[in-house]
């Protein structure tokens, strides 16, 4: 797949990594994660126009069929290509503990 | 993440595997693929409501933030969790060749 990286819709409009500020309450974690109130989450947001960061052949097919049958086949979607690990400090019966999650923070993005 | 498999929107409305019939022309492959002429493309289509087939912790976060900031954070998206290989008979300068593509047909789906 041609892995175009220039967004035809204008700067910042296409699929890319964004950082979203959130509180533990926002995430629904206030009852089991012990941490300051504000956290940063990296996630993949943005449009997936033709040939932009196509993850694979499937994404290419999907875009071609979306053009032909837009009511049936959705456009490719901006999702994480890989993740960064993050350690959560969790509340436990006996106090607190560390747990590493490998699938929590998006590291980079592509269109699928 | 709780990996719910019952669609709260009604049968067939949530993220699942669909088969879409397409010709080589539809796929934009007529000039380099000899066979098959008609392809049944399996792809992931459907909505991703809360807790439905959440791929990982990231999808859970994304849904929670989408509820709070729908204009900023999109809902999780229905994408392939794995792929089935497919063999294409391709035109070459010297004749034809067989090529296996591992990322062409969706095998199962989840929400990311």
């Amino acid at each position: 797949a041609r892995n175009g990286d220039r967004c035809p819709l204008g700067p910042g409009r296409c699929c890319r990594l964004h950082t979203v500020h959130a509180s533990l309450e926002d995430l629904g974690w206030a009852d089991w994660v012990l941490s300051p109130r504000e956290v940063q989450v990296t996630m993949c947001i943005g449009a997936c126009p033709s040939q932009f960061r196509e993850a694979n052949m499937h994404a290419q097919i999907k875009m071609n069929l979306h053009r032909l049958k837009p009511d049936t086949v959705p456009a490719p979607c901006c999702v994480p290509a890989s993740y960064n690990p993050m350690v959560l400090i969790q509340k436990t019966d006996t106090g607190v503990s560390l747990q590493t999650y490998d699938d929590l923070l998006a590291k980079d993005c592509h269109c699928v | 993440a709780r990996n719910g498999d019952r669609c709260p929107l009604g049968p067939g409305r949530c993220c699942r595997l669909h088969t879409v019939h397409a010709s080589l022309e539809d796929l934009g492959w007529a000039d380099w693929v000899l066979s098959p002429r008609e392809v049944q493309v399996t792809m992931c289509i459907g909505a991703c409501p809360s807790q439905f087939r959440e791929a990982n912790m990231h999808a859970q976060i994304k849904m929670n933030l989408h509820r709070l900031k729908p204009d900023t954070v999109p809902a999780p998206c229905c994408v392939p969790a794995s792929y089935n290989p497919m063999v294409l008979i391709q035109k070459t300068d010297t004749g034809v060749s067989l090529q296996t593509y591992d990322d062409l047909l969706a095998k199962d789906c989840h929400c990311v």
Partner: antibody, heavy 123, light 108 residues
Amino acid sequence: QVQLVQSGAEVKKPGSSVKVSCKASGGTFRSYAVSWVRQAPGQGLEWMGGIIPIFGTANYAQKFQGRVTITADESTSTAYMELSSLRSEDTAVYYCARGPIIMGYQFGLFDHWGQGTLVTVSS
Amino acid sequence: SYELTQPLSVSVALGQTARITCSGDNIGSHIVSWYQQKPGQAPVLVIYDKSNRPSGIPERFSGSNSGNTATLTISRAQAGDEADYYCQTWDSIGSVVFGGGTKLTVLG
């Protein structure tokens, strides 16, 4: 094998600034939190602040707020610490240290350290 | 701001058990890490989250944490264990806090 290699020793005049670099190799630079910790001669460890390249923002210990700037260049996998308005009490070995991203706290669990950079402030 | 207090020095006979304490208000509800620093070298993480050891750290090193005291325990102390040891946690705003450090001397 993760390695953090720091720039060489510096001698600075009071009132001036110093910028120390820390180049990472053997790991994914942006996936971790990089902190700066200093140690005055014969004294203990003191956290100055840190940066998470993927977030781009730095956090600083209150004591150093306004006087320290921590940056990161992902293209070269290098973190920098600049300390301004130097005084004799800033004479110390400055370490960069890497750890996982810790939800909310962000810095700590320093599993890899640079070799240290001695900064001497003297008139 | 949150403070961690360590004894300046601890002595242990070769082959015996050394215990280094780290006191802080309700430290039992904090995550505590321990670092070993030998003269002229950078610190090394030896214990995190009560009693987890990074790879390469001998089983002789263990940790515990409850109430107002966290403890680093080094069993069967060796001459090579002689070093400064620092505890570390976070304050309420997420800043990293180190204890003042304890010099461990192995006698004999």
